[in-house]
C-alpha cells in the first residue's frame, strides 16, 4: 500500500513586495483522514498561515475551488506580499483525532520577497 | 459506474458475532474513505464506522464491539461485528466517502444494504 | 454531537407545489451540511453537499441554501417521483456523523 505522499513542487518561490504569491502543494491520497494545514517554519515556534476551518486569515485564500469534490490540491494564494512574508512555508497533513495528529509535512518551499519595482 | 455491494448479513443470537462485507468498484477504492452506515426498521439513519488509511472511527454505541477493516488489494470494506445487541437490528449500508474543500465528508455512494437481525 | 433538528416531521403535497425542508444544527457546522433522498426499500441518494452544491445528476428543481445552523432544502415543483424521506447529515465536526431525523414527503 502506498504510502501518503505531501508534495510540494517548488523548493522555493521570488515574488515581488506588494504581488501575489502561490505556494503549491497536492497529495496523493484522500486518506488518511484529516486536514490540510499551512505553517510558515517548521517546529513548535511555527506560525499557523491557513487553516480552513478555524481561525481568520483575510491574505490567504485556496487556489482550487473550495466545493470541488475530492479535491487534491491544497494551493494557496497570499496576496500584498511584504518583506515579512518571507521565510519557509510547509503543507502538512493531519489525522484526524482528538485533537489532530500532525501525520506528515512537505518539504516546504522559501518565500523571497523582491523589493517592489520603481 | 460506482457499484457496492453488501453480503453476510443474517439472523443471530444476541451476543453473537457477524462479519459483514462490501464488494466496491467502479472507483479507486484504496485512496477513498470507506463507511458503514445503519438504518433501524421505520428509524432514521445512524453512521456506525469510517476508515481511512488505517484509521478507524466508530459511533460510541458500537465501539469496542464493532471492528471496521479493508482489505485494498481485494476492494473489500468489513465490519466485523461481535457481542450483538437486539438494538443492532437494522440494514447496514456500505458508503463510499466523498470529501469537499479541504475537510468533512459525506457519502456519495451507497450500496442496497444488508439486513442484520438480532434475536433470541 | 452536534444535533441535526429536521421539520416538519412530515408532509403532505401535490404534485407541481414548492417545498421547503428545514435542517436546524445545535452549533455551528458552517457550510458542512449534505441532504440525502430515500425512497421506501432503497438506499439513499446524495442530492446537496456544501449545503448547496448539487450532486452530479441531480434535478435543477432540488437546491439547498444555508449556513451556520440554519439550512434548507427546496423542490421548486414536487415531482411524483420525489416521495420519500430527506435527511440531512453534518460532517463539520465528527465523529460521530450525525443525521437529521428525516422528513416524509407524501404524495397529496
Known amino acids: 500500500e502506498e504510502e501518503l505522499q505531501v508534495i510540494q513542487p517548488e523548493k522555493s518561490v521570488s515574488v515581488a513586495a506588494g504581488d501575489s504569491a502561490t505556494l503549491n502543494c497536492t497529495v496523493s491520497s484522500l486518506i488518511p483522514v484529516g486536514p490540510i494545514q499551512w505553517f510558515r517554519g517548521a517546529g513548535p515556534g511555527r506560525e499557523l498561515i491557513y487553516n480552513l476551518k478555524e481561525g481568520h486569515f483575510p491574505r490567504v485564500t485556496p487556489v482550487s475551488d473550495p466545493t470541488k469534490r475530492n479535491n487534491m490540491d491544497f494551493s494557496i494564494r497570499i496576496s500584498n506580499i511584504t518583506p515579512a512574508d518571507a521565510g519557509t512555508y510547509y503543507c502538512v497533513k493531519f489525522r484526524k483525532g482528538s485533537p489532530d495528529v500532525e501525520l506528515k509535512s512537505g518539504a516546504g518551499t522559501e518565500l523571497s520577497v523582491r523589493a517592489k519595482p520603481s | 459506474d460506482v457499484q457496492l455491494v453488501e453480503s453476510g448479513g443474517g439472523v443471530v443470537r444476541p451476543g453473537e458475532s457477524l462479519r459483514l462485507s462490501c464488494a466496491a468498484s467502479?472507483?479507486?477504492?484504496?485512496?477513498?474513505?470507506m463507511s458503514w452506515v445503519r438504518q433501524a426498521p421505520g428509524e432514521g439513519l445512524e453512521w456506525v464506522s469510517t476508515?481511512?488509511?488505517?484509521?478507524?472511527y466508530y459511533a460510541d454505541s458500537v465501539k469496542g464491539r464493532f471492528t471496521i477493516s479493508r482489505d485494498n488489494s481485494k476492494n473489500t470494506l468489513y465490519l466485523q461485528m461481535n457481542s450483538l445487541r437486539a438494538e443492532d437490528t437494522a440494514v447496514y449500508y456500505c458508503?463510499?466517502?466523498?470529501?469537499?474543500?479541504?475537510?468533512?465528508?459525506?457519502?456519495?455512494?451507497w450500496g442496497l444494504g444488508t439486513l442484520v437481525t438480532v434475536s433470541s | 454531537e452536534i444535533v441535526l433538528t429536521q421539520s416538519p416531521a412530515t408532509l403532505s403535497v401535490s404534485p407541481g407545489e414548492r417545498v421547503t425542508f428545514s435542517c436546524r444544527a445545535s452549533?455551528?457546522?458552517?457550510?458542512?451540511i449534505a441532504w440525502y433522498q430515500q425512497k421506501p426499500g432503497q438506499a439513499p441518494r446524495l442530492l446537496i453537499y456544501?449545503?448547496?452544491s448539487r450532486d452530479t445528476g441531480i434535478p435543477d428543481r432540488f437546491s439547498g441554501s444555508g449556513s451556520g445552523t440554519d439550512f434548507t432544502l427546496t423542490i421548486s415543483s414536487l415531482q411524483s417521483e420525489d416521495f420519500g424521506v430527506y435527511y440531512c447529515?453534518?460532517?463539520?465536526?465528527?465523529?460521530?456523523?450525525?443525521f437529521g431525523g428525516g422528513t416524509k414527503v407524501e404524495i397529496k
Open positions: 458508503a463510499k466517502d466523498s470529501t469537499v474543500g479541504w475537510s468533512g465528508d459525506f457519502f456519495d455512494y
Open positions: 467502479g472507483f479507486s477504492f484504496s485512496i477513498y474513505a
Open positions: 476508515i481511512g488509511a488505517d484509521d478507524t
Open positions: 452549533q455551528n457546522v458552517r457550510s458542512d
Open positions: 456544501a449545503a448547496s
Open positions: 447529515q453534518q460532517y463539520y465536526d465528527w465523529p460521530p456523523f450525525t
